[in-house]
Structures are given as C-alpha cells and as structure tokens.
Interface confidence: low
Amino acid sequence: NFMYSKTVKRLSKLREYQQYHPSLTCVMEGKDIEDWSCCPTPWTSFQSSCYFISTGMQSWTKSQKNCSVMGADLVVINTREEQDFIIQNLKRNSSYFLGLSDPGGRRHWQWVDQTPYNENVTFWHSGEPNNLDERCAIINFRSSEEWGWNDIHCHVPQKSICKMKKIYI
C-alpha cells in the first residue's frame, strides 16, 4: 500500500546518508505525516538548513574540506535572523571561519556556494575588513559590538561552522 512504499523509500534514503551521518534527527514538517526534514545528529536546524560547529582548529581551506566531507560547506550567512540563530551556539572567546573569502586580495568577497556577496547583508565589525592580505572571514565577539565579522589570514587555525541543506525524507 501507499504508506508501506513511502516507508521503504524513506529507509533507502536513510541508508544513502548513513555512510556520512550514522544518526539523523527528523521532525515532521507541518501537519503532513509524509513530510519529514532531518539534520544529522548532533547538528542544529534553522529554517531549511542544518548547522555544525566544528571545534577542531584548522586553516580555512582545511575547514572547508572538513565541511565538504560531511556533505556541507562553510557557513553562508544570508540574513540577520540566520546569524542571530548561529551565534546562540558559539562561544564568546572563540572565532569561527565563515564560507566567505577574498581569494585575489582585491576585496572581491565571495561565498563558497556562489551566493552573490551583498554589501547590504554583511555584518563586519566596524573598521573591518581592513587588510588585503587577510583573505578569509571569521565571526567573533567583541565586547563593544557583540558578534560580527573580521578578515584574518587564512592559514591561522580557527574553529568553523558548517552548513548544509536539510535532508527531506
């Protein structure tokens, strides 16, 4: 019957993801029992995305590779609401790589997923970015301005934030 075939499809989809994420946390979307959205355990979810705070300290490139192994990217922040959600899970004495870099050092910032860089939706600390040799962006806490972005050298190991689309089963 219909419910049985739906369940079989779900199970095969879950097996597909199991090699990367042994455990998924799923919630029912809306009122329809057929629509479930999942994030890997222990990732957090906000709107249509899942987030993972990586506490291992790595360079920007290695951090991005680490995210991609998990089927994600370094985080792309699209709205103030999204940033407000993310910072709830961050430690004030740490810095975290974003999926934002300026590879040519010419202040052409680009997101890892090719989302257009929109000056109007950026959250740089005042006076940042301030160094052409600092080509990668972090989010960190400054007591005067709370949470914001700063440009830093890409080789300096930092924690990082990974983001992936929710898994729908």
Epitope: S59, T61, K62, P103, G104, G105, H155
Partner: nanobody
Framework: QVQLQESGGGLVQPGGSLRLSCEVS????????MAWFRQATGKEREFVAA????????VYGDSVKGRFTMTRDHPKKMVYLQMDNLKPEDTAVYYC??????????????????WGQGTQVTVSS
C-alpha cells in the same frame, strides 16, 4: 604553466649563511602565495616559511624563527630565503612552492599547487 626553479644550495659550516632563490615563470606571480619547505633524509616534509601574495605578510616554522627571512621580488618574479646561523639540523633538500589562489599561504603542503625540484643544503663542519 607555472614552473619553479630553486638555486643557491650548497655546503656551509655551522653558524654560516646561505641565500636560496626561487625563480617563478608565470604571468600570475603577483597573485601567488609562496612558501619554502624542506625534507631531510628519512623525514617528513617540513614547513619552513611562507609569504603572502603582496609580500606584506610572512610566517615561519618554529625551528627557523629568528634565523631565516623570506622575501619576494615582484619585477624579477623571484622568491628568496635568507638563512643565517645555520645548524646541522637544517640539512635537507629545500623546496619552493606556490599556491595559485593566494588564499592559503601557510604551513600545509597539501595546499600548494606548484613545486620546484628542490636544492640541497648541507650544514656540516
């Protein structure tokens, strides 16, 4: 095609100095982050120094800090490693490396796209 050619290696006594050069043949030299690595016989490749695309920023491996200086000359498309107060443990083949996106100048050899053939440095009395 990016080609890197090291020179300047040789035999030197402990406490002596050497200057290694790396000639880079590419039109995109000014956007390359550059680095020096070394590999002693039977050991893993070790990070020595790196310099950002503009030359404004450098970073050094712990074992060479205060003794080695890395610079670059944009018009000549050259990178240099001035090595002073050399020690026997500095004996190794020294490699020049370049990273095309200029983003990842640091001590991880996996990040570098282009490599020279190496030049031997021997520190011995």
């Amino acid at each position: 095609q990016v080609q890197l050619q090291e020179s300047g290696g040789g035999l030197v006594q402990p406490g002596g100095s050497l200057r290694l050069s790396c000639e880079v043949s590419t039109d995109t030299f000014s956007s390359l982050a550059m680095a020096w690595f070394r590999q002693a016989t039977g050991k893993e490749r070790e990070f020595v120094a790196a310099i950002s695309w503009s030359g404004a920023s450098t970073v050094y491996g712990d074992s060479v800090k205060g003794r080695f200086t890395m610079t670059r000359d944009h018009p000549k498309k050259m990178v240099y490693l001035q090595m002073d107060n050399l020690k026997p443990e500095d004996t190794a083949v020294y490699y020049c490396a370049g990273d095309l996106d200029g983003r990842t100048w640091h001590g991880d050899d996996l990040e570098y796209d282009y490599w020279g053939q190496g030049t031997q440095v021997t520190v011995s009395s």
